[in-house]
């Protein structure tokens, strides 16, 4: 294949494959709990935005789709899955009502819901 | 590798892969024709919309965006770069205004636009 | 130094239309979400919409949804209020303002405020 | 909608003397509610948000307290500047509304 060509993944079969990472959109509305189960099942996770430039293509996702952000009460911070922090500056996240999960939406924009509502979500799985 | 997991492409780095198709969404604003020659000079073309199955991350899509279909004003038909014509129940053409181009918006739907009016643009390349 | 910068005062008939305007300086414009509230002559506040000027995503109050257009051009920093007809009862003094962020989050409530465009719609 | 209703509507007192605003939601805000001021021929000033935090350059005599449905505000002595009206508003829910106001007037 030419220098400027390259192979994507490896990735779950059908999923889209951009700069090394994996994501799916899944259609079927559930509740933020099931959602994470959903992904987990897949070996994957709720999606996590980490980076402008290496996700780019999520600033023309249409909708609004769980993502892997949630409110710990007992510190008021926010934070991902994995335990890690929302960075500064990546998302603009409008807490519209009151809620402990957030949807993401297009343009690096979150939104904070009530996180028994159902709604689509986007898995993630970083490749190594 | 396990055997649910695959790799997609290849495709131009950096690009997005998705079911061995490889798509890039450009930013800045071009003509039909300069969005044409843009994707060429990539060694691609301009999308081609030829499957809701294949294709079915393009429901998601947010914006406007030029894609390889135009009026051939000869027999009234749209076919799309390659010369292949638009198959029935795949996309619903929105006739806006006047024009022989049209842009790709979002859930499947395209729009009629003068060929000259700047947009942003979509890249396709199909892998083999 | 945060500033929201609003344009004159308007006197029109019934029917006609209006655009006003709210200028934002001092912060990055697409990091937030602006608003505008209204306030009749006498009464009290009331939420009209919000507006996140990176991709003009808006948010109107049911009371005024398709009475009004809230839009912004964010190579301008600027925040728009709209009417295609006005009406008598829209005689009042609008606000911008700019959403406070706490904690890395958007929160509804207005830190800084523009200092208010008055309209006046009368025959 | 929610519905702030604020009591009482004017208040009146004299300079040094401590102000209570009471604001009482027609359901659960939790703490999701915030105090302002404003004064004639002004826009309105955020003093209070998320029922007890004061918001950046306001002076200690200014208080929030309460949560769920009810909420007062309380000005620990009445300095002249602070004869104006104070609304509430709630952001627990969309869309966001405001209580009607309570006018601090001078005795």
């Known amino acids: 294949i030419p220098l400027t060509e390259s192979y994507c993944g490896p990735c779950p079969k059908n999923w889209i494959c951009y700069k090394n990472n994996c994501y799916q959109f899944f259609n079927e509305s559930k509740n933020w709990y099931e959602s994470q189960a959903s992904c987990m099942s897949q070996n994957a996770s709720l999606l996590k935005v980490y980076s402008k430039e290496d996700q780019d293509l999520l600033k023309l996702v249409k909708s609004y789709h769980w993502m892997g952000l949630v409110h710990i009460p007992t510190n008021g911070s926010w934070q991902w899955e994995d335990g890690s922090i929302l960075s500064p500056n990546l998302l603009t996240i409008i807490e519209m009502q009151k809620g402990d999960c957030a949807l993401y939406a297009s343009s690096f924009k979150g939104y904070i819901e009530n996180c028994s509502i159902p709604n689509t979500y986007i898995c993630m799985q970083r490749t190594v | 590798i396990p055997l649910t997991e695959s790799y997609c492409g290849p495709c131009p780095k950096n690009w997005i892969c998705y079911k061995n198709n490889c798509y890039q969404f450009f930013n800045e604003s071009k003509n039909w024709y300069e969005s044409q020659a843009s994707c060429m000079s990539q060694n691609a073309s301009l999308l081609k919309v030829y499957s809701k199955e294949d294709q079915d991350l393009l429901k998601l899509v947010k914006s406007y965006h030029w894609m390889g279909l135009v009026h051939i004003p000869t027999n009234g038909s749209w076919q799309w770069e390659d010369g292949s014509i638009l198959s029935p129940n795949l996309l619903t053409i929105i006739e806006m205004q006047k024009g022989d181009c049209a842009l790709y918006a979002s859930s499947f739907k395209g729009y009629i636009e003068n060929c000259s009016i700047p947009n942003t643009y979509i890249c396709m390349q199909r892998t083999v | 130094e945060v500033q929201l910068v609003q344009s004159g005062a308007e006197v029109k008939e019934p029917g006609e239309s209006l655009k006003i305007s709210c200028k934002n300086s001092?912060?990055?414009?697409?990091?937030?979400?602006v608003g505008w509230v209204r306030q009749m002559p006498g009464k009290g506040l009331e939420w009209m919409g919000i507006?996140?000027?990176?991709?003009?995503?808006?948010r109107y109050s049911p009371s005024f949804q398709g009475q009004v257009t809230i839009s912004a051009d964010k190579s301008i920093n600027t925040a728009y209020l709209q009417w295609s007809s006005l009406k008598a009862s829209d005689t009042a003094m609008y606000y911008c303002?700019?959403?406070?962020?706490?904690?890395?989050?958007?929160?509804?409530?207005?830190?800084?405020w523009g200092q208010g465009t008055l309209v006046t719609v009368s025959s | 909608e929610i519905v702030l209703t604020q009591s009482p509507a004017t208040l009146s007192l004299s300079p040094g003397e401590r102000a209570t605003l009471s604001c009482r939601a027609s359901q659960s805000v939790s703490s999701y509610l915030a105090w302002y001021q404003q004064k004639p021929g002004q826009a309105p000033r955020l003093l209070i948000y998320?029922?007890?935090n004061r918001a950046t350059g306001i002076p200690a005599r200014f208080s929030g307290s309460g949560s769920g449905t009810d909420f007062t505000l309380t000005i620990s002595s009445l300095e002249p500047e602070d004869f104006a009206v104070y609304y509430c508003q709630q952001r627990s829910n969309w869309p966001w509304t405001f209580g009607q106001g309570t006018k601090v007037e001078i005795k």
């Open positions: 303002g700019r959403l406070t962020m706490f904690r890395g989050i958007i929160i509804g409530y207005f830190d800084y």
């Open positions: 001092g912060y990055s414009f697409t990091n937030y979400w």
């Open positions: 507006i996140y000027p990176g991709d003009s995503d808006t």
């Open positions: 998320d029922a007890s």
